[in-house]
């Protein structure tokens, strides 16, 4: 990546890290308005299985691991990217390394959910306060989950699917910050680990993933009012360990692994027409990216 100043543009889709043959340090940004990609400042350490989020206009890269020819190191790191300066800076690390982590943001606080350290599959969850640069453990999940999809809706944190070390999961649970407790919600129709999970129009979407046998292209959404999961149109590509985000009322899925190939494909879901379309390609195929969108 380049170290020059990034153009000051609004609402880009950032993709950080990932895996192709080894963990990657790329940071790239896609501009849906003109279809262009920007090559930005590399992560200071390559990582895959990380998560991305945006707080206060800053992009955070959370957890993951560095799988390289020199070895394999799970990451407890939290790093912050400033789009205005095109620079990364380290923040306080989490209490434990978390590969294949999920993250969500409530009231400007980052929640780091699950993930693995070696063969330990975490059910622990911790919250980061950017103003204090501090992490604090909160109530653990009811289930150990890596490859967990995390989304926030109505100030509640949802953890969806994943792998507990033995089984891939269709279960999901919800965290209530005021009570500091987790409760199970309706299970998905499909077992999904490494799915893309996001919120759009008051529904939680779970796209793709791996059911313990195959990569999936199916997509389902959870209606919090009816507490039911319903299938929507499938993606064009089967994919697990994909990146996902929402931009201007549409869902974007990036990359992933289809069981044979590391995908460069980026698909976009339009809820009005219930259709997926190929919108662009990443500069190279990869799985396990961290994805987030900058605010206006």
């Amino acid at each position: 990546g380049s170290m020059g100043h990034a153009p000051k543009v609004g609402r880009l889709i950032y993709t950080a890290g990932g895996y192709f043959r080894q963990s990657l340090s790329y940071l790239e940004a896609y501009n849906p308005s003109d279809g262009t990609w920007l090559d930005l400042a590399d992560l200071q350490v390559p990582r895959s299985g990380l998560a991305g989020c945006v707080v206060g206009g800053l992009l955070y890269a959370v957890g993951g691991r560095n799988n390289s020819p020199d070895g394999n190191t799970d990451s407890s790191a939290l790093d912050c990217y400033n789009p205005m300066t095109n620079q990364w800076s380290p923040c306080a690390p989490m209490s434990v390394p978390r590969n294949r982590i999920g993250v969500g943001v409530i009231d400007g606080h980052i929640y780091a959910v699950g993930g693995s350290h070696g063969c330990i599959h975490h059910n622990s969850v911790e919250r980061y306060e950017p103003e204090r640069d501090e992490w604090h453990l909160v109530a653990p999940m009811l289930t150990r989950r890596i490859g967990v999809g995390v989304a926030v809706l109505n100030r509640l944190l949802y953890a969806v699917g994943g792998f507990d070390g033995t089984n891939r999961l269709n279960s999901a649970e919800c965290y209530y910050p005021e009570r500091n407790e987790w409760r199970m919600i309706t299970a998905m129709n499909t077992i999904r680990s490494g799915a893309g999970v996001c919120v759009l129009h008051n529904c939680i979407y779970a796209a793709g993933g791996y059911d313990g046998q195959d990569q999936l292209n199916s997509v389902e959404r959870y209606d919090v009012e009816t507490e039911t999961w319903t299938f929507v149109a499938p993606m064009k590509h089967r994919r697990s360990a994909l990146g996902i985000t929402v931009h201007q009322g549409r869902i974007y899925v990036l990359g992933g692994y289809d069981g044979h190939t590391f995908l460069d494909s980026v698909e976009c879901y339009d809820p009005d027409t219930d259709t997926w379309s190929e919108v662009t390609r990443m500069t190279s195929g990869r799985s396990g990216v961290g994805v987030a969108v900058t605010m206006e």
Epitope: C119, I120, F163, T166, Y210, Q213, A241, Y257, G259
Partner: antibody, heavy 122, light 107 residues
Framework: EVQLVESGGGLVQPGGSLRLSCAAS????????IHWVRQAPGKGLEWVAS????????LYAKSVAGRFTISADTSKNTAYLQMNSLRAEDTAVYYC???????????????WGQGTLVTVSS | DIQMTQSPSSLSASVGDRVTITCRAS??????VAWYQQKPGKAPKLLIY???SLYSGVPSRFSGSRSGTDFTLTISSLQPEDFATYYC?????????FGQGTKVEIK
């Protein structure tokens, strides 16, 4: 019944290449991580490489990193170990391994192939 | 890398004897330890996983235990078919590593 059958071993000169195959039956290789473990003549066991079916990520022992490549072809239900730049110290029986389906921590290797012998010598 | 130091490297015992083999990890590996039995010319067979769980089909005379970073495989009453080499393995952290083996021979 779960079965793993390795093939492709043989005699090769230092610097040469071989591709080992591991044909699986009784389960889909897409359903479990696959590992290669080797055993030099009269010696102990050494983990070599693995591939994760969910993320596609591969892991290698430092002794083989950059020279060996693990892969899988789900349509053939077969895993492979491509071995390049072979050295005398790579001489070993190579086993293809699948972890236990039972709850365990890490890689308790429940299913082993019969092994295939790789000899690197001039 | 985590070292698994196995002892003894060999032992002689008689049928009916109680046999104990120990593995010491160079750092914490929690309970992520497995034990294998290998006979000459054959692939290893899983006996114990998660330090103390008996794998399906393995006779109950085999057992495993953990005390901190010390792991023990016990054969309560040695049978003729138990003469073999035994290996421990940690899979707590990358890379997975094995002990150097213990050969159990007939006295």
């Amino acid at each position: 019944e779960v079965q793993l059958v390795e093939s492709g071993g043989g005699l090769v000169q230092p610097g040469g290449s071989l591709r080992l195959s591991c044909a699986a039956s009784g389960f889909a290789i897409s359903a479990s991580s696959i590992h290669w473990v080797r055993q030099a003549p009269g010696k102990g066991l050494e983990w070599v490489a693995s591939i994760d079916p969910e993320t596609g990520e591969t892991l290698y022992a430092k002794s083989v990193a950059g020279r060996f490549t693990i892969s899988a072809d789900t349509s053939k239900n077969t895993a492979y170990l491509q071995m390049n730049s072979l050295r005398a110290e790579d001489t070993a029986v190579y086993y293809c391994v699948r972890r236990a389906a039972a709850k365990d921590w890490g890689v308790a290797a429940a299913y082993w192939g019969q092994g295939t012998l790789v000899t690197v010598s001039s | 890398d985590i070292q698994m130091t196995q002892s003894p490297s060999s032992l002689s015992a008689s049928v009916g004897d109680r046999v104990t083999i120990t593995c010491r990890a160079s750092q914490s590996v929690s309970s992520a330890v497995a034990w294998y039995q290998q006979k000459p010319g054959k692939a290893p067979k899983l006996l114990i996983y998660s330090a103390s769980s008996l794998y399906s089909g393995v006779p109950s005379r085999f057992s495993g235990s953990r005390s901190g970073t010390d792991f023990t495989l016990t054969i309560s009453s040695l049978q003729p078919e138990d003469f073999a080499t035994y290996y421990c393995q940690q899979s707590y952290s990358f890379p997975s590593t094995f002990g150097q083996g213990t050969k159990v021979e007939i006295k």
